[in-house]
Amino acid sequence: PPNRRTCVFFEAPGVRGSTKTLGELLDTGTELPRAIRCLYSRCCFGIWNLTQDRAQVEMQGCRDSDEPGCESLHCDPSPRAHPSPGSTLFTCSCGTDFCNANYSHLPPPGSPGTPGSQGPQAAPGESIWMAL
C-alpha cells in the first residue's frame, strides 16, 4: 500500500547524530512514546544495549531505505556491536507501524549468535552507527 510507515521515535541522551531527518515527527497527544512518519522507507529500526542485567533502548526510528530485514512483521533483534566490555548492541528492522516499539526477544548475553567479548569495540556514539 502507498501509505507511509509510522515508527516509534527515540534517541537516548548522549547518542551522537540523529535519524530525526528521516521522517516527520507526529503529534500523538502524549509526550512518550513519540511517533515518526518515514519519508524514505517503509521500515522501522530499533537498537538496544544489552548488559548483564538489563536491556536499554538506545535509538528507535525510521531507516533511510528499504533493505533486507524490513519485510519482517516484528522486531527480532540480532547482535551488531560491542560498545564496551560486557554490553552488546542489538538491532532490528521491521515493516509494520510501530513494530519497533519493543523487541520480541533478546538472546541472553554470551549465548550462541552473540559476538564474543573480543568482538568489535567502539566508543558509545560510534557503536550506534556501526549497529545501524
Epitope: P2, N3, R4, D27, Y40, S65
Partner: antibody
Framework: QVQLQESGPGLVKPSETLSLTCTVS?????????WNWIRQFPGKGLEWMGY???????SYNPSLKSRITISRDTSKNQFSLKLSSVTAADTAVYYC??????????WGQGTLVTVSS | DIQMTQSPSSLSASVGDRVTITCRAS??????????MHWYQQKPGKAPKLLIY???NLESGVPSRFSGSGSGTDFTLTISSLQPEDFATYYC?????????FGGGTKVEIK
Amino acid sequence: QVQLQESGPGLVKPSETLSLTCTVSGYSITSDFAWNWIRQFPGKGLEWMGYISFSGSTSYNPSLKSRITISRDTSKNQFSLKLSSVTAADTAVYYCAGSRYSWFAYWGQGTLVTVSS
Amino acid sequence: DIQMTQSPSSLSASVGDRVTITCRASESVDTYGNSFMHWYQQKPGKAPKLLIYRASNLESGVPSRFSGSGSGTDFTLTISSLQPEDFATYYCQQSNEDPYTFGGGTKVEIK
C-alpha cells in the same frame, strides 16, 4: 539559503528523451532533503514526478515509472531528470524542488519544455 | 491516487474581503490524527510558494492573515483581509499517500 536552478533544452522532439538538470546552491544535496521534480501543465495542473533522496534512494510517481529516471552528481551538487519517449502531453513547465518534509519549501524558477517536431 | 478537488475554481473579491478556499480529498489525508495537507500560492510566471503546511501551520515569513484548518478529507484556506499582493492562484497538496497530489487550483481575481 537553499537555491535551485533548472537547466536544459526548451524543445524536445516526440519519442526522444527529455533531460533536465537542477543545480543546488547553499546546501549539499547529500546532507538532507528529498530533491524533487514537479511539472505544471499548460492547463495549470501540478504533478509530482519523483525524487532522489540525500542518500541516493529514489521514488517515482507510478504514472511515470516506466519512463522516468532521477539521478545525481554529488561532485557538482546537481540532480537530473530523464523522461523517455516523450509526447506532446509532456509539454509543461518543469520545476525542481527541495523538501525536508513531505511539502515543498524550496523551488527553482521553472523551465518550459515543449515537445514538438 | 488521492484526488484533490478545490472549490471554487475561481473567485472575484475586493481588497479587505475575507476569502475562503476549500479542498476536498477523495480519502482521508490524516495519519494518527495528523493532517498531511499543505497550501501554496502561485503568481504568474513564478514557482509556487509554500503558505501552510500540515493543515494549519504557517510557513515562516507568511503573513498571519493566511490560515488553514480542517482534518480528514475537508480543508480550508482563509485569507482574513485580502491584500493587493494576494491576487494569485492557490493550490492544495496532500502528502499522506504516495504519489503526492495537488488540487486543480483556485484563482483569486480582483472584483
